[in-house]
Amino acid sequence: SDKLYQRKEPVISSVHTKVKGIAEVTENVTEGGVTKLGHSIFDTADYTFPLQGNSFFVMTNYVKSEGQVQTLCPEYPRRGAQCSSDRRCKKGWMDPQSKGIQTGRCVPYDKTRKTCEVSAWCPTEEEKEAPRPALLRSAENFTVLIKNNIHFPGHNYTTRNILPTMNGSCTFHKTWDPQCSIFRLGDIFQEAGENFTEVAVQGGIMGIEIYWDCNLDSWSHHCRPRYSFRRLDDKNMDESFVPGYNFRYAKYYKENNVEKRTLIKAFGIRFDILVFGTGGKF
Amino acid sequence: SDKLYQRKEPVISSVHTKVKGIAEVTENVTEGGVTKLGHSIFDTADYTFPLQGNSFFVMTNYVKSEGQVQTLCPEYPRRGAQCSSDRRCKKGWMDPQSKGIQTGRCVPYDKTRKTCEVSAWCPTEEEKEAPRPALLRSAENFTVLIKNNIHFPGHNYTTRNILPTMNGSCTFHKTWDPQCSIFRLGDIFQEAGENFTEVAVQGGIMGIEIYWDCNLDSWSHHCRPRYSFRRLDDKNMDESFVPGYNFRYAKYYKENNVEKRTLIKAFGIRFDILVFGTGGKF
Amino acid sequence: SDKLYQRKEPVISSVHTKVKGIAEVTENVTEGGVTKLGHSIFDTADYTFPLQGNSFFVMTNYVKSEGQVQTLCPEYPRRGAQCSSDRRCKKGWMDPQSKGIQTGRCVPYDKTRKTCEVSAWCPTEEEKEAPRPALLRSAENFTVLIKNNIHFPGHNYTTRNILPTMNGSCTFHKTWDPQCSIFRLGDIFQEAGENFTEVAVQGGIMGIEIYWDCNLDSWSHHCRPRYSFRRLDDKNMDESFVPGYNFRYAKYYKENNVEKRTLIKAFGIRFDILVFGTGGKF
């Protein structure tokens, strides 16, 4: 509450997160023209990335383009990209939607469709829908430990959200355990009024707000965090503004002296930890 | 403007960026002693990195040291590093400028020069100039979509820079489209009074400032962002303080049961998105 | 000092860091059942990661699990994980402490112990102590250059911590050179009253606070940074809350048509650069 006689100071904050959990992923894998059931286990090293600061990312879905190599190939026949003759293809043209540079030739993509030939990582990425349900939908049961150290330099006061009395096997609950700093990802979504299973398909951004309203006067000292959750990406966003949350990364390797890559389009939840508040003292 | 009767509150912000574009890179490639012209396509997975938070990086230039292996070799003969006898080389010495630990021997680097032998990733990185013009100079035409969600918790008010009415094929322009949040990288530099082609060689840091000056009173409500741009690194910086922006990373692999790496010195532009402002309410 | 007549404004800040140094690492390496002494050199590309923003990480220790592959194997026999019959193992069960999913069978881990068989990255990670002393303990002698650009938009004032008059071969010292922005990592720890050698084993988080108290009135202008250091992680933290600072990442490769990975548990120091302060003007 506002105590107007107090000298207020904004919080200086440092955050450290640790995600726990494993996911079982079952998907169809094609090798040598044969499609079979692939089953794999993903642990933290597979679905999260070494990140700094006030964010962490959990991959919940992905699309792989394996064995790409730099060469010439027909571009992907997305809406408006098909051609019937070379006139439709402009040598040196880079379509921002495409993944390569046109050679000026119109070539067969498959038995029924022709597209402009491009110099690119080939075969070009298929613009297919993210798998539904999400491959790592079980990430809903992962947990994250959040450690938050705060400082009010003007008041020379430091504290943290984890106290020595806390129990490391707790799980945050708004009513029963509001000071526990281990959060089940599914619970975060539930608190924010969002459906994890749905968001996991395309990805999204979730805010974890930590509010410190600190009264540092000795006679009525109080300084504990209050956690709240809200979705930060726009779920109603138009296609052209790239809904959800995804990014592409590549694993490079050499085969028969040719550099190849596997391109991974990773969908997932980016969690932003937003720490704010003030410390007041007479 | 300052309305002194209002209760002001700083903005809580979350940012999401998405870079688009492909670059055609032509460079001399030496294989088996033969130098030929190499041509390759770089897409987002090749020139940017999965990053969190209020920064994104676009690689505009690079120097590669291929096939390095842990062994003994002469260090690079940079200024002051040459030797004529073992006396000049001190066993166990690590020169901060060097990339290895001296063995105490002075050995031939090439036909004319001798340097101290080091235990290092060999052959050691040549300290050559960044290619000029920059290899990915066409990154000037890349675009970045910036999504910014802001919150004034005390006023319980949330908004974002992208409105449902916006057009996903727009490009920001200070006069014609100051609310569009898709920016051409070259335009950002032009607005900041900088030359992209020049900065792309050594790299640099560019600030994209998003200023929210929000009046949250219902009778005169206003809350839209204002974008401005300024260069954050010091272009006049002394050599000793490492001008530009670059970092080294490695790709590791095994060949004939020996661990090898390709070292990449990546030069590029780091874009820092600096969100600030206040929300005022009576 | 507080000048109540002044209009105060919080600082907008951008940070760029550059770490220098090489480490010599000696460790026991087992190949084909034979253990021998391994010796390697780590440079910046090996011990740090391309990071954005106000943090940088220096790896000081690690534990490797080489040649893991997705298959079935006995889980690691940590406290409470051993079994004597299949009844103790539940098909489909994922123990949050374990790294896999149980098949329901109890199988020999070694000659004396049995544990539940799991589908996982195998062999599962051994839960062994971090090496002591830390493998990259010599990181104490690494240096970091910190460049900080600050802006008070309301006062239209910009400056940076590095001035043209500064000497690029300086090292920060609280008394002798308090404006030098090149810091020896060991000195940072000493200033914070911490033991680098000790923290390097398990890792930790160190705060570098840069305080700008700027008087922007022309008649008594002053705007230079003041550096201070404090440890941000809790060194007395209970085991259950994951003391220190570490994360796992993996290097993937193919061998004999099977995807394999080397899992690295990296311990190290995350340095958080916390910039704060105000600019005041009449």
Epitope: L37, H39 | - | G67, T71, I101, S119, V258
Partner: nanobody, 120 residues
Framework: EVQLVESGGGLVQAGGSLRLSCAAS????????MAWYRQAPGKQRELVAD???????NYADSVNGRFTISRDNVRNTVYLQMNGLKPEDTAVYYC??????????????WGQGTQVTVSS
């Protein structure tokens, strides 16, 4: 129906070499650990060598340095290269594989055995 089919056994002189192979056929999800066991007349079946899906190997002391186990994950086949054979290596050699028919449905499978006879 999953089957393990062995081949390569026979009669050989002491000091000679043989190469056993064993292929898994049928419909299954994944071949995990594979191994070779042997049983000499009047004795218990004993482990000769095993190999994980990640190519980690383990040998009985009596064959270490003489025998080499390897596998081909494309063909789901395990091999045993036996050099410097001794009369005491005479036995019926059995192939073993731990195979998942479906996800988390592992079973142990054995081959029918192949005779190796080392004459002095």
């Amino acid at each position: 129906e999953v089957q393990l089919v062995e081949s390569g056994g026979g009669l050989v002189q002491a000091g000679g070499s043989l190469r056993l192979s064993c292929a898994a056929s049928g419909s299954f999800f994944r071949v995990n650990n594979m191994a070779w066991y042997r049983q000499a007349p009047g004795k218990q079946r004993e482990l000769v060598a095993d190999i994980t899906r990640g190519d980690r190997t383990n040998y009985a002391d009596s064959v270490n340095g003489r025998f080499t186990i390897s596998r081909d994950n494309v063909r789901n086949t395990v091999y045993l290269q036996m050099n410097g054979l001794k009369p005491e290596d005479t036995a019926v050699y059995y192939c073993y594989a731990r195979i998942e028919l479906g996800v988390l449905e592992p079973r142990d499978y054995w081959g029918q055995g192949t005779q190796v006879t080392v004459s002095s």
